[in-house]
């Protein structure tokens, strides 16, 4: 922690500029005002101070807003906002896209997942929706930021902006992401034809229930063995050989290669195996013929 | 991560000069260029020259017109040349420098001593 002291006379300070870069910390803790500092922010970045140094300049902004900075400071941080915990981020209030992208182009790249996370989310509650030109800006941005929001903040999403969201885009996303995503996408896509559809769905697929991965089965849309491995086990179980076979096309003879994998190992055990060889992929594993499969859960349920 | 290293102090007599050089082991990737910093015992540490990635140089009052910074990019070097020097100047001399992911650099030092 830097020790108070009191500034000598010749280190006043009356503009944050360049010298500052040559005051030891004592001196910029002791000597620059909080409130000129807030006042003057967009100077700060533009001054080759050390991290050390801005340290500094962070603990006096701390004091000066212990319930959170002000968006005009927010904007201007710059290198400091590297310096900054999902703790202080979370005491912000964000509305400017402006800031936002600012912010993110300073942490692209580096070890910041936590707090851009946290920043996300302060703009969506700031902007009270996910709307168009916060998704065209992360996705410009922070391509897979998306996937850093909550499911509850990315339910604000309107089914409208999803055409703006890029394959790439949900790469991180996980299952409850996806969950909430899909019947977006669902329904923002809903007036295509078969092929386009497929093409504009097939990312937010990870969300699909049974029933909606039964249906692509009838259309003809071969789809791809990464695509597949993505989809919910528990929308995947359900599915026939017969329905695999049409959901895959000629990329069925993929499935041997994943044949160890989820939720490719987990179908194959479901499956009678006289269907499976069916296929002719040598997969292994499912049900001997003869055996009687008797679903417990449903006497339990009824009991 | 770069490491860095100087060598070039020494004790020397009021009014003489030094020249310390900082070698780094690789290309770095500076948000602010490098600094020649230094501490006295029992004080903080303090920058006394800096050069910025563009070239521009920047010195400290108290060594105005007695120390020169410069950059040997092809040794991957930064050197601070110092003459005039007082015994006010006596401290451990660090180089160093700031990346662009929230971190700052030093060497290990290397003592300057002016005393007659």
């Known amino acids: 922690d830097v020790e108070r002291t009191t500034c000598p006379p010749e280190k006043e300070v009356h503009e944050i500029d360049e010298s500052l870069i040559f005051y030891k910390k004592r001196e910029l803790e002791a000597c620059v005002d909080a409130a000129l500092l807030a006042a003057q922010m967009d100077r700060v970045d533009a001054i080759p101070f050390t991290y050390e140094q801005l340290d500094v300049l962070k603990h006096k902004l701390d004091e000066l807003y212990p319930q959170g900075y002000p968006e005009s400071v927010i904007r201007h941080l710059g290198h400091l906002f590297l310096k900054m915990s999902p703790e202080d981020i979370r005491k912000w209030n964000v509305t400017s896209l402006e800031t936002l992208k600012a912010l993110l182009k300073v942490s692209k790249g580096h070890e910041m997942s936590a707090q851009v996370a946290t920043l996300i989310d302060r703009v969506v509650v700031g902007r009270g929706q996910l709307d168009k030109d916060t998704v065209d800006t992360l996705t410009a941005f922070c391509p897979g930021c998306l996937c850093s929001l909550s499911p509850e903040r990315l339910s604000s999403v309107p089914p409208s902006v999803i055409g703006a969201v890029r394959p790439q885009d949900l790469d991180t996303c996980g299952p409850r992401q996806l969950d909430v995503l899909y019947p977006k996408a669902r329904l923002a896509f809903q007036n295509m034809s078969g092929s386009e559809y497929f093409v504009k769905i097939r990312p937010f697929l990870g969300g699909a229930p049974t029933e909606d991965v039964k249906a692509l089965s009838q259309q003809n849309v071969s789809m791809d063995l990464a695509t597949f491995m993505k989809l919910r086990r528990e929308a995947v179980l359900p599915l026939t050989v017969a329905e695999v076979q049409k959901l895959l096309g000629p990329h069925v003879e993929g499935l041997k290669v994943e044949e160890q994998h989820s939720p490719v190992r987990d179908w194959i055990l479901k499956q009678r195996q006289d269907d499976l060889d069916t296929l002719g992929l040598g997969l292994q594993g499912g049900i001997p013929n003869g055996y009687l499969i008797l679903d417990l859960s449903v006497r339990e349920a009824l009991s | 991560q770069v490491q860095l290293q100087e060598s070039g102090g020494g004790l020397v007599q009021p009014g003489g000069s030094l020249r310390l050089s900082c070698a780094t082991s690789?290309?770095?990737?500076?948000?602010?260029?490098m600094g020649w910093f230094r501490q006295a015992p029992g004080e903080q540490r303090e920058l006394v020259a800096r050069i910025l990635n563009d070239g521009t140089t920047m010195y400290a009052d108290s060594v105005k017109g007695r120390f020169t910074i410069s950059r040997d990019n092809a040794k991957n070097t930064v050197l601070l040349q110092m003459n005039s020097l007082k015994p006010e100047d006596t401290a451990v001399y660090y180089c160093?420098?700031?990346?662009?992911?929230?971190?700052?650099?030093w060497g290990q030092g290397t003592q300057v001593t002016v005393s007659s």
């Open positions: 690789g290309t770095i990737f500076s948000r602010n260029g």
């Open positions: 160093g420098y700031s990346d662009y992911r929230g971190t700052d650099y």
